[in-house]
Amino acid sequence: MKVLQEPTCVSDYMSISTCEWKMNGPTNCSTELRLLYQLVFLLSEAHTCIPENNGGAGCVCHLLMDDVVSADNYTLDLWAGQQLLWKGSFKPSEHVKPRAPGNLTVHTNVSDTLLLTWSNPYPPDNYLYNHLTYAVNIWSENDPADFRIYNVTYLEPSLRIAASTLKSGISYRARVRAWAQCYNTTWSEWSPSTKWHNSYREPFEQH
């Protein structure tokens, strides 16, 4: 049994880091493998993660962490029974993938303005809470070419757009994702999408 693709890990900078790797053949990850992780610091404790299958030869493990600070460094040991398959380390602050925003809502009752709001996925005491910026994706269900991205570079989790920038009388979907420049994070996953019917009063043409 060998590791084909070494574990790579990302942290949500809150409580979970996710590590993925590939074995050289079909593997029952949860029965055959264990990922041990330990904070490199005084009197720390070794924890065991039981991986799950992620495709035939792929494994994924969700490492629980009580808190994360930028200096944290973890040792990682991948075991198959008594055999050490791989040894590495992981610094969560250098591999951050934020949590996805939630509760995306489209408010359509504001005089021909669409107000999109969503929730910051972090509690106020988390460092990332005040450092997230967002991308909002809006697309038409009828027209694949009608696909747009709005970058929200301010901290408020909301976006206002004129309803008239979209076509009237058709359905649209929106989703949102987050990233944090301070830790040069990757983008989060997209939030679940929300759907609405876009309609607004066309202004009378002036002749």
């Epitope: 330990q38 904070l39 610091f41 005084l42 009197l43 720390s44 404790e45 009580d66 808190d67 600070v69 930028s70 200096a71």
Partner: antibody, heavy 119, light 107 residues
């Protein structure tokens, strides 16, 4: 809310030993470290050492190594510190402090045990 | 051992004031700087850990900042219940060491 209850005031003679306790209101000691800190008006706060009750690992300040012994009873979530060969310099308030394993800050403190060393 | 120095041993301020308490380490401590409050009855509480992180349940008027060797604790709007002695502590290098404390009093 985690609470730490320390044993009461001790009056001991020079050369003797003292053993104090600290009971933690946690479900399990596993995942925590218990540290001990000395406070005197002259020297301020000094870290004596820390113990991982789950696996028995310990770390001591060189200044107290050999005289301080940290132990724990996992069944009762109680930690102990024994200090031997006492002198008047050991008269102080001793605090226990609980922290998540591997962390360098002390979120939960006991109320302190006053030790007076006097003939 | 790393020496932690709180140059101001006592400080007088009025209720509502913004108060800053400083702490200097004898070498770089990589943000492993924590602040504690000790009340006159001996009760000790963690306020700030890892330079600027507010411990749960601590009022938001407390904040911390700094880097390298120089750190500070700020109380933005002093209240009567903040009368206490404040200690800094480094956790970067064994043994963890504490500052001598800054006693905060009301004018």
């Amino acid at each position: 809310q985690v609470q730490l209850q320390q044993s009461g005031t001790e009056l001991v003679k020079p050369g003797a030993s003292v053993k104090m306790s600290c009971k933690a209101s946690v479900n399990t000691f596993t995942g925590y470290n218990m540290h001990w800190i000395k406070q005197t008006p002259g020297q301020g706060l000094e870290w004596i050492g820390g113990l991982h009750p789950g696996n028995g690992d310990s770390s001591y300040n060189q200044k107290f190594k050999g005289r301080a012994t940290l132990t724990a009873d996992k069944s009762s979530n109680t930690a102990y510190m024994q200090l031997s060969s006492l002198t008047s310099e050991d008269s102080a308030v001793y605090y226990c402090a609980l922290t998540t394993a591997g962390r360098a800050w002390f979120p939960y403190w006991g109320q302190g045990t006053l030790v007076t060393v006097s003939a | 051992d790393i020496q932690m120095t709180q140059t101001t041993s006592s400080l007088s301020a009025s209720l509502g004031d913004r108060v800053t308490i400083s702490c200097r380490a004898s070498q770089d401590i990589s943000n492993y700087l924590n602040w504690y409050q000790q009340k006159p009855d001996g009760t000790v509480k963690l306020l700030i850990y890892y330079t600027s992180r507010l411990h749960s349940g601590v009022p938001s008027r407390f904040s911390g900042s700094g880097s390298g060797t120089d750190y500070s604790l700020t109380i933005s709007n002093l209240e009567q219940e903040d009368i206490a002695t404040y200690f800094c502590q480094q956790g970067n290098t064994l043994p963890p060491t504490f500052g001598g404390g800054t006693k905060l009093e009301i004018k």
